[in-house]
């Protein structure tokens, strides 16, 4: 599998409509929780929780502050921590508790605490529960949590130093935790947790299961340096611990290695960064997408692997276990266990088969089973990705977070659209197209190029958004910027399953998965732009320049995958020649203008899509070079003298749509100053005229004409 190509389009922060939320002096907007039924996004930041309108996050609905007392700050600072940064309250757990309350935990100046947030009054109830084991002490330490039926399952560190890792369930009737032992958890970096509900139709009447994802130091391999291993672990919701062995500890904790590597090379991605569980009505089994980087990542590599949940459960239900060995001078501490496995199977959830054998709860399990799972929490079998290879490998980028949306294109094909954020504040949108990856676009979410810490996807039909949290704020972006594709060709070449061209309105429209009719829309995920209707009108710009001056002819082509070249009177121009230059890789500069430079200039783009090359005329300019007698200015051009010898003209430019009235491109005012009109929103093939005013006195006027479509190809 080759590395993913560069994103086809790059949207700068200012180019697209992004909604932002941030409050002065509030940082670390790293906890996001979406309430779809209330259209509310809850944001946990440093010392504050906000509720904002999920459809427009700039609209703040509520806020509540949870600050650390000066006394606590001082005590924290005495222990060697920074009063300005570490000794504050970073919100780390933001989970739904009921329809009217949230469960919130914060680092609380290295004394983690939890409270209930009443959503009606938007005030904390002041419970001030001990957050130990639910929330890290140190804001720099890893953590994950999920609320399951009113009980919090967490993965974090249990002490001030962060040296004791724990996966626990906070429950009034049955609190459970992992053993503090290296075979169970070895310096883990927690990434994600989620619950997978039992299938009601399974013939085994099994339990709900909670999955944890983390990277830890390997116990299987011991080299000169520490080898990191990505893990998937799971516990059963019905686990109540053992009666004697594993009392108040998990009896169902099992973990396995996640494999994400490139089979044809030595590339192994062993540091887990984020996980997203994709659930969709069309999916028989949930799929989880995992984001990885290699351990030694000096080249900026990232990969995404997708896994069927059933593959992981198969490993836990039927796989072999690992056992520690005491072989001297061996790199491998742990080997496959081939001995007899006690019944009921160690680590298995209590199902109908176990119940039929009178094991109605984990408290009834025999000591042999419990002792075995205590000593063998690690599976020998690994969890392998779908198709045994990554979905995406990208060079020169460090991905941070991932969310995935399953959507249907016009032809009925289903695509898993991956939204992946970077450590430089960007968001990549990618799909798999016939065993190749197509990065549809890159959007710069954060102007300051800061890492995206959290990504969240709304699943409500109609208004769909991606929310991204960073140190400085939260950004809301639509799933697609269809309207930015100005022509049918651009819309089709985008190969965006959310977008289709609407010939009646001549716009690229978003295909919201609603019941609205899709008849007549054009979408071709192969990128075959020949399906686009012929343009009835092609426009060109007419320019008048003064002899000896320099002209810049604009060509706005957004595609990073396209090569732009210029034709003059149907011959291809060599931009490297002394006569011509390229500005910004696209705009044509013509130096030392003479009458011989008059004529038709065309900017064309050439883009490889699959095995086809698609050519587009992006812009067409008709240039006329005039020799102007020194003192005379033709009155018909309504030329206004400005600042000595510089000359400007009143220029009319017709709209490229051909329907709206002409708008002035450059307006010479009565005062003699030049005022530019408001710049139209740029589109994929916008072609604004440009006036170049040189030290050489120069005349440049322009207008837009129309050619028949046959001249436009």
């Amino acid at each position: 599998m080759a590395f993913a190509p560069i994103p086809r389009i790059t949207w700068e922060h200012r180019e697209v409509h992004l909604v932002q939320f941030h409050e002065p002096d509030i940082y670390n907007y790293s906890a996001l929780l979406l309430s779809e039924d209330k259209d509310t996004l809850y944001i946990g930041a440093r010392e504050a929780v906000f509720a904002v309108n999920a459809l427009n996050i700039s609209e703040k609905q509520h806020e509540v502050y949870w600050k650390v007392s000066e006394d606590k700050k001082a005590k924290c600072a005495e222990k060697g921590k920074s009063k300005q940064t570490e000794c504050l309250n970073y919100i780390r757990v933001l989970q739904p508790l009921s329809a009217t309350s949230l469960y919130v935990c914060g680092t609380n100046a290295f004394q983690p605490a939890c409270d209930h947030l009443n959503l009606t009054s938007f005030k904390f109830l002041g419970k001030n529960e001990d957050g130990k084991g639910r929330c890290p002490f140190d804001p720099a330490h890893s953590y994950t949590s999920v609320m399951v039926d009113g009980e919090l399952y967490s993965g974090t560190s249990y002490n001030f130093l962060g040296s004791e890792p724990i996966i626990s369930r906070n429950s009034s009737h049955s609190p459970l935790r992992t053993e503090y032992a290296i075979p169970w958890l070895n310096e883990p970096s927690f990434v994600f947790a989620d619950v997978i509900r039992k299938s009601p139709d399974s013939p085994d009447g099994e339990d709900d299961r909670v999955y944890f994802f983390f990277t830890e130091v390997s116990v299987e391999y011991e080299f000169v340096f520490r080898v990191l291993i990505p893990r998937i672990a799971r516990v059963c919701k019905g686990d109540q611990g053992g009666l004697r062995t594993l009392q108040k500890k998990w009896t169902s904790f099992l973990k396995a290695r996640l494999i994400c590597s490139r089979p044809d090379s030595g590339l192994v991605f062993n540091v887990l960064r984020d996980v997203f569980v994709l659930r969709s009505p069309g999916l028989k089994v949930p799929v989880f997408y995992a984001l990885f980087t290699p351990q030694l990542n000096n080249v900026g590599l990232s990969a995404v692997c997708a896994y069927n949940l059933s593959t992981a459960e198969e490993v836990f239900s039927h796989g072999k276990y690992m056992q520690s060995t005491t072989v001297e001078q061996s790199h491998t501490k742990w080997v496959r266990y081939n001995g007899p496995v006690p019944k009921p199977r160690p680590g298995a959830c209590i199902d109908s088969e176990a119940r039929a054998a009178n094991y109605t709860s984990s408290l009834n399990l025999p000591d042999k089973t419990l002792q075995f799972v205590k000593d063998h929490p690690l599976m020998d079998d690994s969890v392998t990705p779908i198709d045994n290879r990554p979905r995406l490998i990208k060079k020169d980028v460090n991905y941070t977070q991932i969310v995935v949306d399953r959507t249907q294109a016009l032809d009925g094909t289903v695509y898993d659209v991956m939204f992946v954020s970077t450590d430089r504040g960007a968001l990549h949108k990618a799909i798999s197209l016939e065993h190749a990856v197509h990065i549809i676009e890159e959007t710069q979410l954060f102007q300051d190029f800061e890492p995206v810490q959290t990504l969240l996807l709304s699943s409500k039909k109609g208004n769909r958004f991606v929310y991204a949290g960073s140190n400085s704020g939260v950004v809301q972006a639509p799933l697609a910027f269809c309207g930015k594709h100005g022509t049918c060709e651009d819309c089709v070449l985008a190969r965006d399953p959310y977008c289709a061209w609407s010939p009646p309105t001549a716009t690229c429209v978003a295909l919201h998965q609603t019941e609205s009719p899709s008849r007549g829309l054009i979408q071709e995920m192969s990128g075959d732009a020949s399906v686009c209707p012929d343009k009835s009108k092609g426009s060109y710009r007419q320019h008048f320049f003064k002899h000896g001056g320099t002209a810049e002819l604009k060509c706005s082509q957004k595609s990073n995958l396209a090569r732009v070249f210029w034709k003059f009177q149907n011959g291809v121009l060599k931009a490297e020649s002394p006569k011509y230059g390229l500005m910004g890789r696209k705009n044509l500069l013509i130096f030392n203008l003479s009458e011989g430079d008059s004529g038709v200039y065309q900017c064309l783009s050439e883009e490889r899509v699959k095995n086809k090359t698609v050519f587009q005329v992006v812009a067409k300019h008709v240039l006329e070079v005039k020799v102007v007698p020194k003192p005379v200015v033709a009155p018909t051009l309504s030329v206004v003298q400005t600042e000595g010898s510089r000359i400007a003209t009143k220029v009319l430019v017709a709209s490229t749509q051909g329907s709206s009235p002409p708008t002035p491109a450059v307006q010479a005012t009565s005062s003699g100053a030049i005022t530019l009109p408001p710049k139209p929103a740029p589109t994929g093939t916008s072609c604004e005229p440009k006036i170049v005013i040189n030290t050489v006195p120069q005349l440049h006027s322009e207008k837009t004409m129309y050619l028949k479509s046959s001249d436009n190809r």
Partner: antibody
Framework: EVKLVESGGGLVQPGGSLSLSCAAS????????MSWVRQPPGKALEWLGF??????????ECSASVKGRFTISRDNSQNILYLQMNALRAEDSATYYC????????????WGQGTSVTVSS | DVLMTQTPLSLPVSLGDQASISCRSS???????????LEWYLQKPGQSPKLLIY???NRFSGVPDRFSGSGSGTDFTLKINRVEAEDLGVYYC?????????FGGGTKLEIK
Amino acid sequence: EVKLVESGGGLVQPGGSLSLSCAASGFTFTDYYMSWVRQPPGKALEWLGFIRNKANGYTTECSASVKGRFTISRDNSQNILYLQMNALRAEDSATYYCATYGRLGYTMDYWGQGTSVTVSS
Amino acid sequence: DVLMTQTPLSLPVSLGDQASISCRSSQSIVHSNGNTYLEWYLQKPGQSPKLLIYKVSNRFSGVPDRFSGSGSGTDFTLKINRVEAEDLGVYYCFQGSHVPWTFGGGTKLEIK
């Protein structure tokens, strides 16, 4: 002893309706999913659908071939499973079986003897 | 829907021989809980089907140990060691992992 007895089969005209019953005994009826399976003469078995147990709200699943025409229901006080068949077609002619859906790792562990339905003008 | 394809359609054997029936699913029938609900049923002439094997390789109670099931993912096999007269009939594979549940087309085991 688990016993399932189907009844209600017979000859019906295309477009007509028929209701099949399955009387169950020997087990706690409300604890079990119940399935319907049919077999056209000389052909393979075809799963039609099931009705879930009490714990899962007695909701149903049906195969696409009968969805919208056939309805599965149950009378838990009488321990009877029903299959209401409407808009019958010639291709619905078959022997219809009811079966219990076991919860020990297997699906249809006990079957009735079947009842024959013929759709013909 | 998951399509179950059985081969052969008909299997003539001599009593005492070993018989092998294959079943292939159009997609993985591993349930989200990690189990594979692949079952084998035997239907004798004029009778209702009887469960033989569940979860790929587990024999149902009362089923003789000459019946064995194997396979994983999408490929499954039923083997009958030393075929006896009472084993004759039509064998069906069935998947109960993904709704709608589906049967194979059947394999008729008959005397050569």
